[in-house]
């Protein structure tokens, strides 16, 4: 009669996270009498997974009915597998002993590998906004995947980026891995509607990669261009001066009119128009009563955009060509929220 052998027919088993792993083990003889135990790992630090004799193992079920007299199948199923369950599992036959059972023979081991999906990539951009022509960095992170092999790509509006660096951690063996990538993106004035996409491909995703996105609208600041113009005379002694604030983003903007350096009016951009590229335009205007002035007037449109230092544009309003009404002390009439009468 041959001595009992413990046979683990599978060298390795690959299971997706959340599924059930079946670890096969058979003995070739009914004797010696004694329990089967399953361990993860070998040596003194091995972890008990299942003990036929005693204990509570809620995730483990036996494949066959161990109450049958001639049973020699000691295969087990482990439910709800996670990456932490990865390792080599040994089916070990003990023989009955006094006072304790004695380890008799071990199977060769079955390596359990766990396929775990990466988490949804999270893309984050710089903390502060940047202006066109500047280079900004975006990071992409995904965690908890196994095996280690993974592919990460960056796109801007569907165009693949090449300037990025990627690390997968840890470098050595682990139950699961994380990926971290940093991409450099050069901003353009047209990027308000642009998206940066991080795409992660992994064996567990069955050809359907995960994507994380960042909108450049959260990152970009397009400073405005200013133009101050004097409109044709609207009525006798009145001149309409406009300040065109063009192509700015985001909308947060405050405009101040200065007359010869003195603050005349401050307003916040409200009713703006949006351009196709996502930037905004806005116009402010002043109705100037030139008859109230003896000398030329320097009008300045000063704009503070998104908390940045103010930019300004000036316009010299000539009044000498207009005859003055002697002793005229008439107050000009306010004709609109964007109008300003000058005395």
């Amino acid at each position: 009669e041959e001595e009992l052998q413990v046979i683990q027919p599978d060298k390795s088993v690959l299971v997706a996270a959340g599924e059930t792993a079946t670890l096969r083990c058979t003995a070739t003889s009914l004797i010696p009498v004694g329990p089967i135990q399953w361990f993860r790992g070998a040596g003194p630090g091995r972890e008990l997974i299942y003990n036929q004799k005693e204990g509570h193992f809620p995730r483990v079920t036996t494949v066959s009915d161990l109450t049958k007299r001639n049973n020699m199948d000691f295969s087990i199923r482990i439910g709800n597998i996670t990456p932490a369950d990865a390792g080599t599992y040994y089916c070990v036959k003990f023989r009955k002993g006094s006072p304790d059972d004695v380890e008799f023979k071990s199977g060769a081991g079955t390596e359990l590998s766990v396929r775990a999906k990466p988490s949804a990539p999270v893309v984050s951009g710089p903390a502060a906004r940047a202006t066109p022509q500047h280079t900004v960095s975006f990071t992409c992170e995904s965690h908890g995947f196994s095996p280690r092999d993974i592919t990460l790509k960056w796109f801007k509006n569907g165009n693949e980026l090449s300037d990025f660096q990627t690390n997968v951690d840890p470098v050595g063996e682990s139950v699961s891995y994380s990926i971290h990538s940093t991409a450099k993106v050069v901003l353009t004035r047209e990027d308000v509607h642009s998206q940066v996409i991080c795409e992660v491909a992994h064996v567990t995703l069955q050809g359907d990669p995960l994507r994380g996105t960042a909108n450049l609208s959260e990152t970009i600041r397009v400073p405005p261009t200013l133009e101050v113009t004097q409109q044709p005379v609207r009525a006798e002694n009145q001149v309409n001066v406009t300040c065109q604030v063009r192509k700015f983003y985001p909308q947060r903007l405050q405009l101040t009119w200065l007359e010869n350096g003195n603050v005349s009016r401050t307003e916040t951009a409200s009713t703006v128009t949006e351009n196709k590229d996502g930037t905004y335009n806005w116009m402010s205007w002043l109705l100037v009563n030139v008859s109230a002035h003896r000398d030329d007037v320097k009008l300045t449109c000063q704009v503070e955009h998104d908390g940045q230092p103010a930019v300004s544009k000036s316009h010299d309003l000539k009044v000498s060509a207009h005859p003055k009404e002697q002793g005229s002390n008439t107050a000009a009439e306010n004709t609109g929220s964007n109008e300003r009468n000058i005395y």
């Epitope: 009669e1 041959e2 001595e3 009992l4 003889s29 009914l30 004797i31 010696p32 009498v33 329990p35 089967i36 036929q52 004799k53 005693e54 161990l66 109450t67 049958k68 007299r69 049973n71 023989r95 009955k96 002993g97 006094s98």
Partner: antibody, heavy 128, light 106 residues
Framework: AVTLDESGGGLQTPGRALSLVCRGS????????MGWVRQAPGKGLEFIAS????????HYAPAVKGRATITRDVGQSTVRLQLNNLRAEDTGTYFC?????????????????????WGHGTEVIVSS | ALTQPSSVSANPGETVKITCSGD??????YGWYQQKSPGSAPVTVI????KRPSGIPSRFSGSASGSTATLIITGVQVEDEAVYFC??????????FGAGTTLTVL
């Protein structure tokens, strides 16, 4: 102390049935394999039947297979051997035996390879 | 099957060894059972190859190697005179016994 007491022996008629009872004390019969071993006059020890600690595994020697049934009653702490269709060669002393291994799981089966206690025996004579 | 010598003899105080050979190495445990007269209750003197039940004198010891078990009585005494049966099991027999060895103390 562990004790095993057999009863039910005596003079039996061939072809009739016999019921032997072993009462155990000092231990729980639900935790140990139990069995019957007989000794014919002038002969050695012969395994007859055994029952596992789970109460469902049983094994019989070829000489009695098909004629013998071993059962247990945990509440009464007894193990019973029913032997039908008695033959002259069933004559001998029947001993109740207890295995040493405390078994709380199924695949101890019904082995009696580490007997640590015996009953005093009950003599069975099959004769017409 | 288990094979043991039919008889051994020794003087009081001597060491006696009784062997029991299995037909293969798959007899993992051996026990030794002492029967002082035919039909009387056997007494287990060794089980688990080398374990001695409480109440059994320390002069009884056992060992097993491969397919052979040995009962050793160190300093045999007159009251040790008996028939000694070895027992074991194999995959198809829950219990098997040798034919017995008669120990005579001269």
């Amino acid at each position: 102390a562990v004790t095993l007491d057999e009863s039910g022996g005596g003079l039996q008629t061939p072809g009739r049935a016999l019921s032997l009872v072993c009462r155990g004390s000092g231990f729980s019969i639900s935790s140990y394999n139990m069995g019957w071993v007989r000794q014919a006059p002038g002969k050695g020890l012969e395994f007859i039947a055994s029952i596992g600690s789970d109460g469902s595994s049983t094994h019989y020697a070829p000489a009695v297979k098909g004629r013998a049934t071993i059962t247990r009653d945990v509440g009464q702490s007894t193990v019973r051997l029913q032997l039908n269709n008695l033959r002259a060669e069933d004559t001998g002393t029947y001993f109740c035996a207890k295995d040493a291994y405390q078994c709380s799981y199924a695949t101890c089966n019904d082995y009696l390879d580490t007997i640590d206690a015996w009953g005093h025996g009950t003599e069975v004579i099959v004769s017409s | 099957a288990l094979t043991q010598p039919s008889s051994v003899s020794a003087n009081p105080g001597e060491t006696v060894k009784i062997t029991c050979s299995g037909d293969n190495s798959a007899h993992y445990y051996y026990g030794w059972y002492q029967q002082k007269s035919p039909g009387s209750a056997p007494v287990t003197v060794i089980y688990y190859n080398d374990k001695r039940p409480s109440g059994i004198p320390s002069r009884f010891s056992g060992s097993a190697s491969g397919s052979t078990a040995t009962l050793i009585i160190t300093g045999v005494q007159v009251e040790d005179e008996a028939v000694y049966f070895c027992g074991s099991a194999d995959s198809s027999n829950p219990a098997i016994f040798g034919a017995g060895t008669t120990l005579t103390v001269l």
